[in-house]
């Protein structure tokens, strides 16, 4: 539908078009499989318009149906990454807090490949914090064209 002139002058956040695109900051310490993200114009092609970062995890500020997308490339990647020398390396995206809404949204495995990518539509609520867990010992790339994570509000 077409926007009125007044709507066109409103910031995207007020229209409900929350959106974020993040780049990898760092991996967690021992026993913490989470990936920690960062975003902002000073960092390059990453940004947050509505959602916010809480200790490197993405927090939703508006209810709605969102497109969630992620790509992760391994900087330490072997043809045997998922076989005899390693526990299978998997990436899981889920709501990790609040605990009452904890659920896995995406789960992907590196099957003798160095990159995984996926997206899905899913309802998210204000206050939901999304965590991205990378199991195993392998190290993800921080190149911004290889590893990124984002959400886009689609509709209420």
């Amino acid at each position: 539908q077409r926007l009125s002139r007044a709507q066109q002058q409103l910031p995207l956040e007020s229209l409900g078009w929350d959106i974020a695109e993040l780049q990898l900051n760092h991996t967690g310490p021992q026993q913490d499989p989470r990936l920690y993200w960062q975003g902002g114009p000073a960092l390059g092609r990453s940004f947050l318009r509505g959602p916010e970062l809480d200790k490197g995890q993405l927090r939703i500020r508006r209810d709605g149906i969102y497109m969630v997308h992620i790509q992760v490339t391994l900087a330490i990647c072997s043809s045997t990454s998922t076989s005899r020398h390693h526990h299978p390396t998997t990436l899981a995206v889920g709501i990790c807090s609040p605990a009452s809404r904890s659920i896995s949204l995406l789960r992907l495995s590196f099957h003798q490949g160095c990159t995984i990518a996926s997206q899905r539509l899913t309802p998210l609520a204000r206050g939901d914090t999304l965590c991205t867990n990378l199991t195993g010992t392998l190290l993800p790339s921080r190149n911004t064209d290889e590893t990124f994570f984002g959400v886009q509000w689609v509709r209420p």
């Epitope: 760092h26 991996t27 967690g28 310490p29 021992q30 026993q31 913490d32 900087a75 330490i76 990647c77 072997s78 043809s79 990454s81 160095c114 010992t137 392998l138 190290l139 993800p140 790339s141 921080r142 190149n143």
Partner: antibody, heavy 120, light 108 residues
């Protein structure tokens, strides 16, 4: 100026242990993955082990897996390599090396190395 | 693991000449993730090139890298006295990262 200074090398008998240290300065140590790379006398360079910036992820060459342990203390800007069950073929100069920001294991800065000799 | 073979083993040239060093991989190097290092006796290696063709910070433009897949080349357009050293290639696209055994560039 980035500086990496290894220490802890020396002469050790087969089956013995040694702990190498690498003191880092001139960069935000906790931001970068680090590796140990070795070079036996007159031989090629050989990557040994790496550790992520936070210390939560480690990776080893098959030749040292189960015998060597890499670790780091970000509060002290120091990288370590604990070497157990040493063999004659572990004799080499051991370098600590800083990864590029991307995490990929190529090395933009190296220490001067410390010599480990395993001999009876 | 990927085996890197460097040739020639030794290159005897005079200052001002062009040096062409080869590095061949036993299988294709992912995303051309190949680096070149310079090493002088008793010193640590020094990064020259990464990603097959990108010069590292502070490296003079007489050093250039090229190639893709399994065949890579380091070229020194005009040898300076300080360039006589051993040059090693390294692939970091597939784990474990591996090094070639080096080409020695010596004064003729």
């Amino acid at each position: 100026e980035v500086q990496l200074l290894e220490s802890g090398g020396g002469l050790v008998q087969p089956g013995g242990s040694l702990r190498l240290s690498c003191a880092a300065s001139g960069f935000t140590f906790s931001t970068y993955a680090m590796s140990w790379v070795r070079q036996a006398p007159g031989k090629c360079l050989e990557w040994v082990s790496l550790i992520s910036g936070s210390g939560g992820r480690t990776y080893y060459a098959e030749s040292v897996k189960g015998r060597f342990t890499i670790s780091r203390d970000n509060s002290k800007n120091t990288l370590y390599l604990q070497m157990n069950s040493l063999r004659a073929e572990d004799t080499a100069v051991y370098y600590c090396a800083k990864h590029d920001y991307s995490n990929y294991p190529y090395f933009d800065y190296w220490g001067q190395g410390t010599l480990v000799t395993v001999s009876s | 693991e990927i085996v890197l073979t460097q040739s020639p083993g030794t290159l005897s040239l005079s200052p001002g000449e062009r040096a062409t060093l080869s590095c061949r991989a036993s299988q294709s190097v992912r995303s051309n993730y190949l680096a070149w290092y310079q090493q002088k006796p008793g010193q640590a290696p020094r990064l020259l090139i990464y990603g097959a063709s990108n010069r590292a910070t502070g490296i003079p433009d007489r050093f250039s890298g090229s190639g893709s897949g399994t065949d890579f080349t380091l070229t020194i357009s005009r040898l300076e006295p300080e360039d006589f050293a051993v040059y090693s290639c390294q692939q970091y696209g597939i784990s474990p990262p591996t090094f070639g055994c080096g080409t020695k560039v010596e004064i003729k």
